[in-house]
């Protein structure tokens, strides 16, 4: 494929290979894909520095790179078309595996405003100087090159791989060699921690005439993010060296019988694993890590902790300690939110009380219910409210407009009703005459 | 589609030991976890074993440890459980089973009834 | 080893009508990546086990969504909405956290 010597850095969940090799972008993220990953991201400064050390490994490998400013391809990339936007970290590129955009960025320089082609960025190492952690790659865009012309000072890639979990290294207790074998086709006996799915050759001895031993491994998840070769006891164990040779293999105390066998032990606090070798704290939890009021949860087999919050908080950015979720962001309330401490309420608006289909939902309050009317004579409910009505001789009154006040119809706009005597009545009126004069059947004239 | 096809029947003296083989076809046989789950007549399910085909690691139920040896063929896609110094106790069906991506033990084999009788 | 506790021993149900079988644990199952590894499966007479839900909610493929599952740490609930006559069988918790894996005694519904 024209990408050769390769360096590999295994370190949480991810692998980082570096390639040297004088291709393009596309052939760069083509060759990382062919292996299940994608050329790297850089999305935090812990990123860069592990990015670097897979750097400095090639670095240590090749002979001499033809370019002092060498460039390795990373997985920033800008589409032909999208321009740039000097506001964000990224300046508008993203990562070619996706993913959201990150606050980090290590720009070399100001960048130029280009949207008519693609661009892509590269690492600028400067090979006259040493690589230091303080002095990090710095990030270059340019043209993203076409096969052949990878670009100018372009000497290789850096991939990226992303792993459920890792294996710890297997541990041998004499002479011998482990090689791992990468879901990502590269081999290695030196990795500080081995992905998922890796296997492992054990040849045991101390060369061809003494080998005696060889076995085979692979990293598996052996319970819920627990990971393993499933190996029990420190391998290539050998009664000439007992715990003089790399402690036995064992990762804190090695015990030695009189007939040359030998044992792994675990100091105070600390107990032995199924592996027989490792040593892992008997209670993470016991130091109190969480703060708060954030719960210590130990993992399977008391390897690890996390810490827990109670319903209405979040872990905060340290994962030790709660802080409150505003539920209200969600909209969880049909009218009011209002975000208390470890909760929410739903509040209504006035004219609503709580109730209908659905958490936090609100109906209407029938206010001309039996027994609540504000009204003194007619009432109507609407929709968050009502209205007062007054029957026939009486109009409504009173500042909120509930009370019925008698309409004096004697002295109504209209003018006199009656033809001589008026008498206002309680919601009505009625006529009456002078003395010799009789009410007419119409109860308005007098005759 | 993913199947587990079992040994059939067998009966045995106490004090002897049986082999049941399981089949296995329509996935990655090397890359999962096969299970062996024990069902004593009218009983519960009880758990006993698991083999990783890949390597061959194994994990047993401390009960049975000692008695029990679980192997794999890679070439033939088929695991293979042998118990020992049987006894009475150990009539029961044989299930192989699948442990899935999420800890399930998702496919199941039709069973293997082994009787242990003098 | 985690010890569980199912309840109850048999489960007599009239078609249509809800049902409700629970499972305790010794110890939580909730690991700390936030996954409860708890399971349901069904032992339908005459049959292997099958899967029902995984990692105390998830209906496995080709599960009726009539089935549903529930819990917090160590106590579980499995729920059928609406009984129908195919669902008769022995109903397991199982607990796959830490080896050896561990089922529940079993719960048998049938039909009333």
């Known amino acids: 494929t024209g990408a050769d010597t390769e360096a590999v850095v295994c370190v949480g969940t991810a692998c980082y290979t570096a390639h040297s090799g004088k291709l393009s972008a596309a052939e760069a993220q083509n060759h990382c894909n062919q292996n299940g990953g994608n050329l790297a991201t850089v999305k935090s400064k812990e990123e860069a520095q592990h990015v670097q050390r897979v750097l400095a490994q090639l670095l240590r490998r090749e002979a001499a790179l033809t370019a002092r400013m060498s460039k390795f391809w990373i997985g920033l990339q800008r589409e032909k078309g999208k321009c740039l936007d000097p506001s964000l970290p990224l300046k508008g590129f993203s990562w070619v595996g996706g993913g959201e955009d990150t606050p980090y960025s290590n720009w070399h320089k100001e960048l130029r405003n280009s949207c008519i082609s693609k661009r892509c960025v590269s690492l600028l190492l400067d090979l006259s100087q040493p690589l230091l952690p303080s002095r990090l790659p710095k990030w270059s865009e340019g043209p993203c090159g076409s096969p052949g012309s990878p670009g100018s000072n372009i000497e290789g890639f850096v991939c990226k791989f992303s792993f459920k979990g890792m294996c710890r290294p297997l541990a041998l207790g004499g002479p011998g060699q482990v090689t791992y074998t990468t879901p990502f086709q590269t081999t290695s006996s030196s990795l500080e921690a081995v992905p998922f799915a890796s296997a492992a050759n054990v040849a045991c001895g101390e060369g061809d005439k003494d080998e005696t031993q060889s076995h085979y491994f692979l990293c598996k998840e052996k319970a819920p993010d627990v990971f393993d070769w499933g190996s029990s006891g420190p391998l290539c164990v050998s009664p000439k060296y007992g715990c003089n040779f790399n402690n036995g293999g064992c990762h804190q105390d090695c015990f030695e019988g009189g007939d040359g066998s030998f044992l792994c032990g675990c100091r105070p606090g600390f107990r032995l694993l199924d592996d027989l070798v490792t040593c892992a704290s008997r209670n993470p939890c016991s130091s109190s890590p969480c703060r708060g009021g954030a719960t210590c949860v130990l993992g399977p087999h008391g390897k690890n902790y996390t810490c827990r919050c109670p319903q209405g908080y979040q872990l905060d950015s340290s994962q030790l300690d709660c802080v409150d979720v505003d539920e209200c962001q969600d909209s969880p309330c049909a009218q009011e939110c209002v975000n208390t401490p470890g909760g929410f309420r739903c509040e209504c608006w006035v004219g609503y009380e709580p109730g209908g289909p659905g958490e936090g939902a609100c109906q209407d309050v029938d206010e001309c219910a039996l027994g609540r009317s504000p009204c003194a004579q007619g009432c109507t409910n609407t929709d968050g409210s009502f209205h007062c009505s007054c029957e026939e001789g009486y109009v409504l009154a009173g500042e909120d407009g509930t009370q019925c006040q008698d309409v004096d119809e004697c002295v109504g706009p209209g003018g006199p009703l009656c033809d001589s005597l008026c008498f206002n009545t309680q919601g009505s009126f009625h006529c009456g005459c002078l003395p010799g004069w009789v009410l007419a059947p119409n109860g308005v004239s007098c005759t | 589609q993913v199947q587990l096809v079992q040994s059939g029947a067998e009966v045995k003296k106490p004090g002897s030991s049986v082999k049941v083989s399981c089949k296995a076809s329509g996935y990655a046989f090397s890359s999962y976890w096969l299970n062996w789950v024990r069902q004593a007549p009218g009983q519960g399910l009880e758990w006993f074993g698991r083999i990783y085909p890949g390597d061959g690691d194994t994990d047993y139920n401390g009960k049975f440890k000692g008695r029990v040896t679980l192997t794999a063929d890679k070439s033939t896609s088929t695991a293979y459980m042998e118990l020992s110094s049987l006894r009475s106790e150990d009539t029961a069906v044989y299930f192989c089973v699948r442990g899935d991506g999420y800890w399930a033990m998702d496919y199941w084999g039709q069973g293997t009834t082994v009787t242990v009788s003098s | 080893d985690i010890v569980m506790t199912q309840s109850p021993l048999s489960l007599p149900v009239t078609p249509g009508e809800p049902a409700s079988i629970s499972c305790r644990f010794s110890?939580?199952?909730?690991?700390?990546?936030?996954?409860?590894?708890l399971y349901w499966y069904l032992q339908k007479p005459g049959q292997s086990p099958q899967l029902l839900i995984y990692?105390?909610?998830n209906l496995a493929s080709g599960v009726p969504d009539r089935f549903s599952g529930s819990g917090s740490g160590t106590d579980f609930t499995l729920k059928i909405s609406r009984v129908e006559a195919e669902d008769v069988g022995v109903y397991y918790c199982?607990?796959?956290?830490?080896?050896?894996?561990?089922f529940g005694g079993g719960t048998k519904l049938e039909i009333k």
């Open positions: 199982a607990q796959n956290l830490e080896l050896p894996w561990t």
């Open positions: 990692q105390m909610s």
């Open positions: 110890q939580s199952l909730l690991h700390s990546n936030g996954i409860t590894y």
